[in-house]
C-alpha cells in the first residue's frame, strides 16, 4: 500500500511543494453504484477520513516514491444493507504544515473514482489507480458488523422492546418481516441498543461501545467527531456532538451530515473537505460532470465551475431533479435525462412541455364567422351559412343538399337559401302539405306512404332514423380520423423522442 509518483514519470514529485513539512490524509467516500454519474450524489453509503497521519518532511535529493501513509484502516460505517455494487472515491489530501498565512493549508493531490462489485465478508481486494502523475496502491473489503450477516449484511434481529406479531420481546426480522428472530438470552442488563449476544449469557458490544453491559461509549470511535456506530442498518447514533456542530465548513460553506461524517456544500471558488481549498487549479479538473472551470489558473486563485444543464453545486457534483419543478403541463410525464428534459404528453396534448391542447378551441380559429364548438373530447367548427369544411374555409352551395322538399325550388341567397314551394306545400323547407278543406297543415308523408298503409309508413320512418344514425356515426368517424391525423405527427415525434430517451437512459 503506497501513494507516490507513478513509474516512468521522471523526477519524483514531492507532495509538499517545497514549502516545509506536510501530512497526507485520505478521504474515502462510498456512493451507490447504480447511478450513471458516480459523482452526482453525496457519499450516501458513508464517508470517513484517515487518522494518525505521520508527518512527511521533504529532504533535498530524497526520493518521493514512498510516502508515509496513515496507520491502520480507514473504516467507513455504512447505512442499511450492503448494496454489493458501489462507487469508491478515494481522495488524497495534503495538509501543509508550518508557518504561513492562514494556518494549515489543504490541497487535493489526487482523486480516484471507480465502480466496484464486492460482497461483504470476502477477502481483501487489491487495486492500483493512477490519476495524473500520482499512483495509489490500496486494498478494500466490506465487513458486516454483528448482528448483520451475509453478503448483503442483512440484519439478524435481537431482543428489543418493540410491539410486533412475534412473541413477547421479539420483533420481526429485517428484511424478512414474516420471520421472527430466535430468542437469545443475553447477560441480564446487556444494552439492547449497543450490545448483542450469539451465545446465552454473553454481552458483545457493537463498535464504539464497551463495558460489561456495552453501556460505555469508547472515546475513539470509527465514526467521525465522536459519533457512535449503531447497528449495521442505522449507521451512526447521536449521543455525542454531531459532525456539523460548530460548522466545520469554512468560507461560508454549509454543512450536512452523512453517515456519521459531514459534507460541506462549498460556495463558488472553494473546494475541499471543509471548503478551505482554493489552491486547486482548473487543470486538475475539479468540476465534475463536464463542468467548465473558470479562473484557477494558479493554486492561489480561486476557480468557479459553470455546470452543464441538470447539475449544480460548487463542483457540479449534484444532479438537479428538474422534474421536481413540474415543468410538464397538463399531466405530462417528466423525464430528466441529465443533458435534456423531456415531457411525455398525455393523449390530446403536445409541445415540448405539453402546453398545446389539441382538443380545445383556444388555438383553433374557425374562418368566415364560424364558431368553435367543444364536446365529446373533440372540437369542430360550426360554420356560418354559405361556408363549410373543417375550418369553414370552403364556400358551400346551400342548395347542393336539395333542402327543399316536395319538388320545391331552392334559391341561394347571401344570407342562406329560400325555398319556392310547389302547389299544395308550404313551410321554410316546403315540408308541410296544405289540406284542401282548409284544415291545418300537417307534415307530409312521402308519396306512396299514406295513412292507409301504416306498415309501410312505419318502415319508412325506421329507414329515415337509420339514415340519420348512419350520418351521425359517419360524422363522428370523420372527426376521429381528422384528430388522429393531427396527432400522428406529434406521436411520430414522441416515438422518436422516446427511442432517444431509451438509448440515453441505457447509455
Amino acid at each position: 500500500h503506497s501513494f507516490g509518483p507513478g513509474p516512468g514519470l521522471g523526477t519524483p514529485r514531492s507532495p509538499c511543494n517545497a514549502r516545509g513539512p506536510c501530512r497526507l490524509f485520505f478521504r474515502v467516500c462510498l456512493k451507490p453504484g447504480v447511478s450513471q454519474e458516480a459523482t452526482e450524489s453525496l457519499c450516501a453509503l458513508g464517508a470517513a477520513l484517515s487518522t494518525s497521519v505521520p508527518v512527511y518532511t521533504e529532504h533535498p535529493g530524497e526520493s518521493a516514491a514512498a510516502l508515509p501513509l496513515p496507520d491502520g484502516l480507514v473504516r467507513v460505517p455504512f447505512r442499511d444493507a450492503w448494496p454489493g455494487t458501489f462507487s469508491l472515491v478515494i481522495e488524497t489530501w495534503r495538509e501543509q504544515l508550518g508557518e504561513h498565512a492562514g494556518g494549515p493549508a489543504w490541497n487535493l493531490l489526487a482523486r480516484v473514482v471507480g465502480r466496484r462489485r464486492l460482497a461483504a465478508g470476502g477477502p481483501w481486494a487489491r487495486d492500483v489507480q493512477r490519476t495524473g502523475t500520482w499512483e495509489l496502491h490500496f486494498s478494500y473489503r466490506a465487513r458486516c458488523e454483528p448482528p448483520a450477516v451475509g453478503a448483503a449484511c442483512a440484519r439478524l434481529c435481537r431482543s428489543r422492546s418493540a410491539p410486533s406479531r412475534c412473541g413477547p420481546g421479539l420483533r420481526p426480522c429485517t428484511p424478512f418481516p414474516d420471520e421472527c428472530e430466535a430468542p437469545s438470552v443475553c447477560r441480564p442488563g446487556c444494552s439492547p441498543e449497543h450490545g448483542y449476544c450469539e451465545e446465552p449469557d454473553e454481552c458483545r458490544c457493537l463498535e464504539g461501545w464497551t463495558g460489561p453491559l456495552c453501556t460505555v461509549p469508547v472515546s475513539t470511535s470509527s465514526c467521525l467527531n465522536s459519533r457512535v456506530p449503531g447497528p449495521a442498518s442505522t449507521g451512526c447514533l447521536l449521543p455525542g456532538p454531531g459532525p456539523c456542530d460548530g460548522n466545520p465548513c469554512a468560507n461560508g460553506g454549509s454543512c450536512s451530515e452523512t453517515s456519521g461524517s459531514f459534507e460541506c456544500a462549498c460556495p463558488r471558488g472553494f473546494y475541499g473537505l471543509r471548503c478551505e481549498v482554493s489552491g486547486v487549479t482548473c487543470a486538475d479538473g475539479p468540476c465534475f460532470n463536464g463542468g467548465l472551470c473558470v479562473g484557477g489558473e494558479d493554486p492561489d486563485s480561486a476557480y468557479v465551475c459553470h455546470c452543464p444543464p441538470g447539475f449544480q453545486g460548487s463542483n457540479c457534483e449534484k444532479r438537479v431533479d428538474r422534474c421536481s419543478l413540474q415543468p410538464c403541463q397538463n399531466g405530462g410525464l417528466c423525464l430528466d435525462l441529465g443533458h435534456a428534459l423531456r415531457c411525455r404528453c398525455r393523449a390530446g396534448f403536445a409541445g415540448p412541455r405539453c402546453e398545446h391542447d389539441l382538443d380545445d378551441c383556444a388555438g383553433r380559429a374557425c374562418a368566415n364567422g364560424g364558431t368553435c364548438v367543444e364536446g365529446g373530447g373533440s372540437r369542430r367548427c360550426s360554420c356560418a351559412l354559405g361556408f363549410g369544411g373543417r375550418d369553414c374555409r370552403e364556400r358551400a352551395d346551400p342548395c347542393a343538399s336539395r333542402p327543399c322538399a316536395h319538388g320545391g325550388r331552392c334559391y341561394a341567397h347571401f344570407s342562406g337559401l329560400v325555398c319556392a314551394c310547389a302547389p299544395g306545400y308550404m313551410g321554410v323547407r316546403c315540408e308541410f302539405a296544405v289540406r284542401p278543406d282548409g284544415a291545418d297543415a300537417v307534415p307530409a308523408a312521402p308519396r306512396g306512404l299514406r295513412q292507409a298503409d301504416p306498415q309501410r309508413f312505419l318502415a319508412g320512418v325506421i329507414a329515415v332514423i337509420v339514415v340519420v344514425v348512419i350520418a351521425i356515426v359517419a360524422g363522428i368517424v370523420v372527426l376521429v380520423i381528422s384528430r388522429k391525423k393531427r396527432m400522428a405527427k406529434y406521436e411520430k415525434a414522441e416515438i422518436k423522442e422516446m427511442g432517444e430517451m431509451h438509448r440515453e437512459l441505457n447509455a
Partner: antibody, heavy 117, light 107 residues
Framework: EVQLVESGGGLVKPGGSLRLSCAAS????????MNWVRQAPGKGLEWVGQ??????????HYAESVKGRFTISREDSKNTVYLQMNSLKTEDTAVYYC????????WGQGTTVTVSS | NIVLTQSPATLSLSPGERATLSCKAS??????VSWFQQKPGQSPRLLIY???NRYTGIPARFSGSGSGTDFTLTISSLEPEDFAVYYC?????????FGGGTKVEIK
C-alpha cells in the same frame, strides 16, 4: 500549460479506416470528459462524439452521422483519447479536433482527415 | 437537434469599430450559449460561456448577451487580432450544436 495534440490523420479511400489519437498534457486527464469535434473544409463546427470518465464506465455518446462507424476510447494511463473511424465516407473529410469537458474549453490544434478515391 | 442561425454571414468593419454578431436558436436554450473565435489555420477558442460570461483571459472588449432564442456577441472596439470567424454554440440540449459562423473581415 495545457496541451492537446492530435495525430493520425491522413488520406484514406472511401470505406477505409483510420485511428486518430489525442495526447493531453498539463491537465489531470482522468478527470476530464473528452470530445471530438470536426470541421469540413470551409464549413462550420460539428460535434462528433464524447467519452466520459472511468467513474461513468467510460460512457460514450455519438452524433447520428457517425453512429455505428466511429468509436471513441481512452487510456487514462497514457493521457490519451482515441477516435477509431471505420467505413469512412467522403463527407467525413474534415479537420478533427479533440476538446475537453461539456463546454469544449481546451482544444487541440487539429489533424486533417481526407477521404477520397 | 437545435439549429443555430448566425447573421450576418460576413461583417466588414474597420479597426476601432463596434461589431455586433447575432445568433438565433430554433428553440429556447436558456443561457446555455457559448461563443468561439477561430482564426485561419488555428483551432477554435472559447470566448464567452453562459451567454454573457467572459472565459479566462478574454479581453473586456468582448461581451455577450441574450437568453432564450436570441443572443448577441459584441466587440466594443475591434483590434487587428479580432478579425476572425466567430461561432455560437448551444449547450442546453444534447448534442451540442454550432451556428454556421460569422466572418468579421477588415473593410
Amino acid at each position: 500549460e495545457v496541451q492537446l495534440v492530435e495525430s493520425g490523420g491522413g488520406l484514406v479511400k472511401p470505406g477505409g479506416s483510420l485511428r486518430l489519437s489525442c495526447a493531453a498534457s498539463g491537465i489531470t486527464f482522468s478527470n476530464f470528459w473528452m470530445n471530438w469535434v470536426r470541421q469540413a473544409p470551409g464549413k462550420g463546427l460539428e460535434w462528433v462524439g464524447q467519452i466520459r470518465l472511468k467513474s461513468d464506465d467510460y460512457a460514450t455518446h455519438y452524433a447520428e452521422s457517425v453512429k455505428g462507424r466511429f468509436t471513441i476510447s481512452r487510456e487514462d494511463s497514457k493521457n490519451t483519447v482515441y477516435l477509431q473511424m471505420n467505413s469512412l465516407k467522403t463527407e467525413d473529410t474534415a479537420v478533427y479536433y479533440c476538446t475537453t469537458g461539456y463546454y469544449f474549453d481546451y482544444w487541440g490544434q487539429g489533424t486533417t482527415v481526407t477521404v477520397s478515391s | 437537434n437545435i439549429v443555430l442561425t448566425q447573421s450576418p454571414a460576413t461583417l466588414s468593419l474597420s479597426p476601432g469599430e463596434r461589431a455586433t454578431l447575432s445568433c438565433k436558436a430554433s428553440e429556447n436554450v436558456g443561457t446555455y450559449v457559448s461563443w468561439f473565435q477561430q482564426k485561419p489555420g488555428q483551432s477554435p477558442r472559447l470566448l464567452i460561456y453562459g451567454a454573457s460570461n467572459r472565459y479566462t483571459g478574454i479581453p473586456a472588449r468582448f461581451s455577450g448577451s441574450g437568453s432564450g432564442t436570441d443572443f448577441t456577441l459584441t466587440i466594443s472596439s475591434l483590434e487587428p487580432e479580432d478579425f476572425a470567424v466567430y461561432y455560437c454554440g448551444q449547450f442546453y440540449s444534447f448534442p451540442s450544436t454550432f451556428g454556421g459562423g460569422t466572418k468579421v473581415e477588415i473593410k
